[in-house]
Interface confidence: low
């Protein structure tokens, strides 16, 4: 019956209290493209390289990091995927030309404190929000 | 003097209270690739197309939407870029092989309510978080 079919489907699908069930994968790679899955990469940014060395006193640079990697089917638990990303992945699987894969983006960002010269050449200590990537996910 | 130089710079520059100043652009396109800038696109998702019609009673589908487009230099104000994305864009500008551009991802997500059958074939009304894209930005 339809009822028993639904129960069978329910047993087969993993449930989560808050999210649409994720399809898990043991692999950290998308085998078809051999590109690593979405993750945080280390990146040190020098303020001199950005041309900002004359107004930023300290630090000279900082560990900004960045996100990169595939958000391919199946999304694994490490990918911190939103419900929308899970839906989008399935839509992309069926219509790859129509809808892109979700993208690998920061899920946690931290601030850094910067010592700099203001408009009147006063030395100011200020916290700049969302400067450091702490975690990445599929969005 | 360095002090007067800084004052002169300050007269020429636009400042922002919370964020690293964004470089604005009137264009919604990255001229080199002719791809539109990061924005929200409309997308209706049918639960039948996803194969979920036997456990989701209502709705039959929903306006999920998705994000797509370029996060290229210069980032304009409509791109809701984080400070990190601004920094990453500049690093990519100087080292395109080393660091990717920021990606176009949801900045605002809404929930939807779904009526479905649980494991015991009970009818449940549940709110699923982060299902609908309301806004996109460069992250």
């Amino acid at each position: 019956s339809a009822s028993s079919r639904r129960r069978q489907q329910s047993r087969n699908r993993s449930t989560q209290s808050q999210d649409v069930a994720r399809v898990s994968s043991a692999s950290d790679y998308n085998s078809s493209e051999l590109k690593t899955a979405c993750r945080k990469h280390e990146l040190y940014v020098s303020f001199q390289d950005l041309g900002w060395q004359d107004w930023i006193i300290a630090p000279k640079g900082y560990a900004a990091n960045y996100c990169d990697g595939e958000c391919s089917f199946p999304l694994n638990a490490h990918m911190n995927a939103t419900n929308h990303a899970i839906v989008q992945t399935l839509v992309h699987l069926m219509n790859p030309e129509y809808v892109p894969k979700p993208c690998c983006a920061p899920t946690k960002l931290n601030a850094i404190s910067v010592l700099y010269f203001d408009d009147n050449s006063n030395v100011i200590l200020k916290k700049y929000r969302n400067m450091v990537v702490r975690a990445c996910g599929c969005h | 003097s360095a002090s007067s130089r800084r004052r002169q710079q300050s007269r020429n520059r636009s400042t922002q209270s919370q964020d690293v100043a964004r470089v604005s652009s009137a264009s919604d396109y990255n001229s080199s690739e002719l791809k539109t800038a990061c924005r929200k696109h409309e997308l209706y998702v049918s639960f039948q197309d996803l194969g979920w019609q036997d456990w989701i009673i209502a709705p039959k589908g929903y306006a999920a939407n998705y994000c797509d487009g370029e996060c290229s230099f210069p980032l304009n104000a409509h791109m809701n870029a984080t400070n990190h994305a601004i920094v990453q864009t500049l690093v990519h500008l100087m080292n395109p092989e080393y660091v990717p551009k920021p990606c176009c991802a949801p900045t605002k997500l809404n929930a939807i309510s779904v009526l479905y059958f649980d494991d015991n074939s009970n009818v449940i009304l549940k709110k699923y978080r982060n299902m609908v894209v309301r806004a996109c930005g460069c992250h």
């Epitope: 004359d54 | 710079q9 100043a21 470089v23």
Partner: nanobody, 130 residues
Framework: EVQLVESGGGLVQAGGSLRLSCAAS????????MGWFRQAPGKERDFVAA????????YYTASVKGRFTVSRDNAKNTVYLQMNSLKPEDTAVYYC???????????????????????WGQGTQVTVSS
């Protein structure tokens, strides 16, 4: 007041080279950061390259890095853009611009900001044929 006059544009085949020059009038040339921008038909004006007051710092957009070289001669009040390995997509009007930015100035008014530049030349056409 600074006046800028570009020269050196023209028609060149893909893979070829051109050297653009920008001559500045006035004795304050060395107090300006100099930039090159370009505008293709029907498109916005885009940043290409910039050089600091002293010539010690140079900046490039990703699509030209490794192919174009920006430099300046403060004794001659001239800034140059050496363009090698030209591609059809480099076709545009190229503008020279002068602005009072430092190599270490703030985001929003540094080498990449069009608003940073106070003075602009009339432009020189570069056409790259395939």
């Amino acid at each position: 007041e600074v006046q800028l006059v570009e020269s050196g544009g023209g028609l060149v085949q893909a893979g070829g080279s051109l050297r653009l020059s920008c001559a500045a009038s006035g004795r304050t040339f060395s107090s300006y950061g100099m930039g090159w921008f370009r505008q293709a038909p029907g498109k916005e004006r885009d940043f290409v390259a910039a050089v600091s007051k002293s010539g010690g710092s140079t900046y490039y957009t990703a699509s030209v890095k490794g192919r174009f070289t920006v430099s300046r001669d403060n004794a001659k009040n001239t800034v140059y853009l050496q363009m090698n390995s030209l591609k059809p997509e480099d076709t545009a009007v190229y503008y020279c611009a002068a602005g009072r930015w430092e190599s270490g100035s703030r985001p929003g008014s540094t080498w990449y900001g069009e608003r940073t530049y106070d003075y602009w030349g009339q432009g020189t056409q570069v056409t790259v044929s395939s």
